[in-house]
């Protein structure tokens, strides 16, 4: 790989995945590439196929076994390499000892659901997906809410700084149609990212009662 | 800033192995990413391996066949480089080197993305 045309990287969902983005200027879209993964102290490796994302990169899993298996722990290294088929011959194109604990990036919050509604209120709980339990309570979430007229880049982000996966949303517009997210961060790890947004939750408000203020 | 100092070079054998240290001081050693580069006789400096601040992501070049391990300790202040199974090739002037940019251990960084160098130690092995 030649200086500063190629990127490699990766993140852990801290169960049983690596998702790794490998890019390179001017490589060829049809080239074939793989990634490896060799743990420094398991039996097992794992390889999976690069495709293409975009015009110069190209993605995969590492899928290291079942979704809520602990495959990794904190003292794990994994060793990932990047191999290209050059005609018979796999030629490595990026290595990179990688610890999965401090790369990480957890799957999407799921279940979302409406506890429950009033005119201006609105309580959304969720739970997490694929989360180890090394983590406890060392999680951290946020929240947007979508209100009309506006986009999800203008929404205000709501921080819950511990393990709370519920949240009453006030002050909200009686007879008003909402849309919801979430996503999730572990506290641990010097690349640990935030996960996708959840898929959004849409609800509706109460309508105000005739004659009364609410 | 950090000053850095080598230790751990010498003559060996093919097939033996050897442990290069890197030890830092007069700075905050946690801030800096650490690399490691050579230079064999009559050649460029060449890059070796590069670690962030934390440790998290390591990137090796691929001329090191997986020989090679850099790790830090960065309550030691310390950075370490692993050569398994030397080859008369390996044989070159071995540098660490400092970085106080941000890396994120995602890119095969240059030389000159490295800002403090130590003086080098020497790696001879012998066939």
């Known amino acids: 790989a030649v200086n500063g045309t190629s990127q490699f990287t990766c993140f852990y969902n801290s169960r049983a995945n690596i998702s790794c983005v490998w890019s390179q200027d001017g490589a060829l879209q049809d080239t074939s590439c793989q990634v490896h993964a060799w743990p420094d102290r398991r039996r097992w490796n794992q390889t999976c196929e690069l495709l293409p994302v975009s015009q110069a990169s190209w993605a995969c899993n590492l899928i290291l076994g079942a979704p809520d298996s602990q495959k990794l722990t904190t003292v794990d290294i994994v060793t990932l390499r990047v191999l290209c088929r050059e005609g018979v011959r796999w030629r490595v194109m990026a290595i990179q000892d990688f610890k999965p604990f401090e790369n990480l990036r957890l799957m999407a919050p799921i279940s979302l659901q409406v506890v429950h509604v009033e005119t201006h209120r609105c309580n959304i709980s969720w739970e997490i997906s694929q989360a180890s339990h090394y983590f406890e309570r060392h999680l951290e979430f946020e929240a947007r809410t979508l209100s009309p007229g506006h986009t999800w880049e203008e929404a205000p982000l709501l921080t819950l700084k511990q393990k709370q996966e519920w949240i009453c949303l006030e002050t909200l517009t009686p007879d008003t149609q909402y849309e919801f997210q979430v996503r999730v961060k572990p506290l641990q790890g010097e690349f640990t990212t935030w996960s996708p947004w959840s898929q959004p939750l849409a609800f509706r408000t109460k309508p105000a009662a005739l004659g009364k203020d609410t | 800033q950090v000053q850095l100092v080598e230790s751990g070079g010498g003559l060996v054998q093919a097939g033996g192995s050897l442990a290069l240290s890197c030890a830092a001081s007069?700075?905050?050693?946690?801030?800096?990413?650490m690399g490691w580069f050579r230079q064999a006789p009559g050649k460029e400096r060449e890059f070796v391996a590069a670690?962030?601040?934390?440790?998290?992501?390591?990137m090796y070049a691929v001329s090191t066949e997986g020989r090679f391990s850099c790790s830090r300790d960065n309550a030691k202040n310390t950075v370490y480089l692993l050569i398994k199974n030397l080859k008369p090739e390996d044989t070159a002037v071995y540098y660490c080197?400092?970085?106080?940019?941000?890396?994120?251990?995602?890119?095969?960084?240059?030389?000159?993305?490295?800002?403090?160098w130590g003086q080098g130690t020497q790696v001879t092995v012998s066939s």
């Open positions: 080197a400092a970085r106080t940019s941000y890396y994120d251990g995602t890119y095969y960084p240059a030389s000159s993305d490295f800002d403090i």
């Open positions: 007069g700075g905050t050693f946690s801030s800096y990413a």
């Open positions: 670690t962030t601040r934390g440790g998290g992501r390591t």
